[in-house]
């Protein structure tokens, strides 16, 4: 035979082809061997012109020999050399996938390698490559984008040899905070529209709470816990109602003292109060705000005023909450009863945002003393809170 060649070489297979002998022959004897590989010999029919070599070792140089037989006669032997491909790593998998990180793992190829080339690409076309050492079987991807589809590929290297690439596809978690504990975390997850969101107290998925998030005022990220806007909701409620909360989160409502206690126990929070009346606006911000637990009767801490509404909350600092059926204020009379509301009354109030809507009688209405006094019921009021360090978190998120 003549013209011995190999084709379709892979890491474990190759196809031997030859030109047949001019004379008719009975058979061809094929043998192949490689370094550290025992010789394999096969006999095939005399009318065969190709033979599939299987179970080859990867990244190995083979010597292939063939001669013809006719009866006792043997032709001269022709020879060809070929090298099998480097085999690929196996079972590439992405695990521990988070919003910005993932762990790639794989099993090494059978052949020895000098390293691996890792390539990972996002749907927006961002490609990153990294070469890792020969003994590595995992690699942590960092600085990924949340909620993004990625294709990760790996190729084994051995000097100039490169294996075929294998790939896996994964999607990063869409949320920086899978269980946001407040509206600031919801916002940092990418939610920038004001409206209803589910937060998880202490990040515990069993402690879900539906809240209204204000994502626009002063950078957003605020949990609104009180809204007065039209007088449709009755705010002259008892202790139990104020502890639990009431109303429609999209309309007028009170979030609940138990919820406020749990939220403000998660860290340091700031309070913002937004007031609006006949086209005028004012606000107050307090950089320290917390509400104690039921044992303290939801004691208020509010410090560090700035704003345009005037510091009316300072008068209420350190006070327990009062309702008509649980009088904790320092007055002889029951402030909640006298002023038909509920608040952290003292004797009695400079702030009465849970007072009677539209009532301009002295101290009876929705009052913020240092803005509109006690004889004007304010049309719109919201109280809201967010972490005191929100600006820092926001900056870190933007840099990421």
């Amino acid at each position: 035979p003549s013209g011995l060649v190999t084709a379709n070489i892979t890491d474990s297979e190759a196809l031997a082809r030859w030109q047949p002998a001019i004379a008719t022959v009975d058979s061809y004897v094929i043998s192949y061997t490689g370094e550290k590989v025992p010789e394999i010999t096969r006999t095939v029919s005399g009318n065969t012109v190709e033979y599939a070599l299987t179970d080859l070792e990867p990244a190995t140089e083979y010597t292939l020999r063939i001669f013809a037989e006719k009866g006792p006669q043997k032709s001269s032997t022709i020879t060809a050399k070929f090298t099998t491909d480097l085999d690929s790593p196996r079972d590439l998998t992405a695990t521990e996938v988070q919003s910005e990180t993932a762990l790639l793992t794989w099993r090494p190829p059978r052949a020895s390698v000098t390293g691996y080339l890792l390539v990972y690409e996002s749907v927006d076309g961002t490609v990153k490559e990294v070469i890792v050492g020969p003994d590595t079987t995992s690699y942590s991807l960092a600085d990924l984008s949340p909620s993004t589809h990625y294709t990760a590929k790996i190729q084994a290297l051995n000097g100039p040899l490169r294996s075929n690439m294998i790939q896996t596809i994964f999607t990063t978690i869409g949320l920086l905070y899978p269980f946001p504990k407040d509206c600031s975390q919801a916002m940092l997850n990418g939610d920038t529209t004001s409206g209803l969101y589910t937060i998880y107290l202490n990040g515990d998925k069993a402690e879900a709470l539906e809240v209204f998030c204000d994502m626009t005022s002063d950078g957003g990220g605020w949990i609104v816990f009180l809204r007065r806007k039209n007088g449709r909701e009755n705010f002259y409620q008892n202790w139990k109602a104020y502890a639990a909360g009431f109303g429609d989160r999209r309309e007028e409502f009170w979030l609940g003292l138990d919820n406020l206690n749990k939220i403000t126990a998660q860290g340091q929070y700031e309070l913002r109060v937004d007031l609006r009346d006949h086209g005028e606006t004012a606000f107050a911000v307090y950089d320290k705000f917390s509400v104690g637990d039921a044992k303290t009767r939801y004691k208020l801490k509010v410090e560090g005023y700035s704003g345009t509404a005037g510091d009316s909350m300072a008068y209420h600092n350190g006070r327990s909450f009062s309702t008509f059926d649980k009088d904790t204020d320092s007055a002889i009379t029951n402030c909640a009863l006298s002023y038909k509301g509920a608040f952290w009354y003292r004797n009695c109030h400079r702030v009465n945002l849970m007072g009677r809507y539209g009532d301009n009688n002295h101290s009876q209405g929705v009052n913020w003393f240092h803005w509109k006094g006690h004889e004007h019921s304010i049309q719109f009021a919201e109280m809201k809170l967010r972490p005191s360090n929100f600006r820092n978190l926001e900056g870190r998120r933007k840099r990421a």
């Epitope: 410090e303 005023y305 700035s306 510091d311 300072a314 008068y315 600092n317 320092s330 007055a331 002889i332 009379t333 003292r346 004797n347 009695c348 109030h349 002295h362 101290s363 006690h374």
Partner: antibody, heavy 120, light 107 residues
Framework: EVQLVESGGGLVQPGRSLRLSCAAS????????MHWVRQAPGKGLEWVSG????????YYADSVKYRFTISRDNAKNSLYLQMNSLRAEDTALYYC?????????????WGQGTMVTVSS | DIQMTQSPASLPTPVGDRVTITCRAS??????LNWYQQKPGKAPKLLIY???NLETGVPSRFSGSGSGTDFTLTISSLQPEDFATYYC?????????FGQGTKVDIK
Amino acid sequence: EVQLVESGGGLVQPGRSLRLSCAASGFTFDDYAMHWVRQAPGKGLEWVSGISGSGGSTYYADSVKYRFTISRDNAKNSLYLQMNSLRAEDTALYYCAKDISAVPDTFDIWGQGTMVTVSS
Amino acid sequence: DIQMTQSPASLPTPVGDRVTITCRASQYIQGFLNWYQQKPGKAPKLLIYDASNLETGVPSRFSGSGSGTDFTLTISSLQPEDFATYYCQQSYSTPQTFGQGTKVDIK
């Protein structure tokens, strides 16, 4: 122990200026509003001026507005009253008083006072 | 400005008697009313804040009541050390104004 010590009083001619100081100790100074209250000889108490804990808001009685300026240095735990264009009717014992709150409210601690006499 | 009117201006009283001093505000002030005691040559001392709350260290014979515009300071049994001038003060709005004082002296 919470203590307020006034200084800077004295005899001054009408139209002249005087600066009163009040040194505070024993409490977190910037957490509380501070005030000046005066008492003319043989008369009752008259609130003169107040300043919020941060120093961001100031308050004055009409009788001293535009003539007196209240200020504070929280780093030095000190309160001041700059008195300009003094009149005979400003003659009084001037007390420095601590508030119970960060904004004007109730005076729970008083100094012993410093006497200002305006006379030619 | 809110005017504070105290009565009486002077109150000669024997030791052991009950003393009542009234204070009226010219406008509604909720419970934003404080009472001070001043002895001759001394600085005023806070007795009652928020109309009815006894300041720490003040004897329980002192009590306050009232809300809105009318307020009362009561000394249930006058002691020798209680002879002094008493002032009411509204903390409802600035300027914070004092009553003209009530002098309680020995009868």
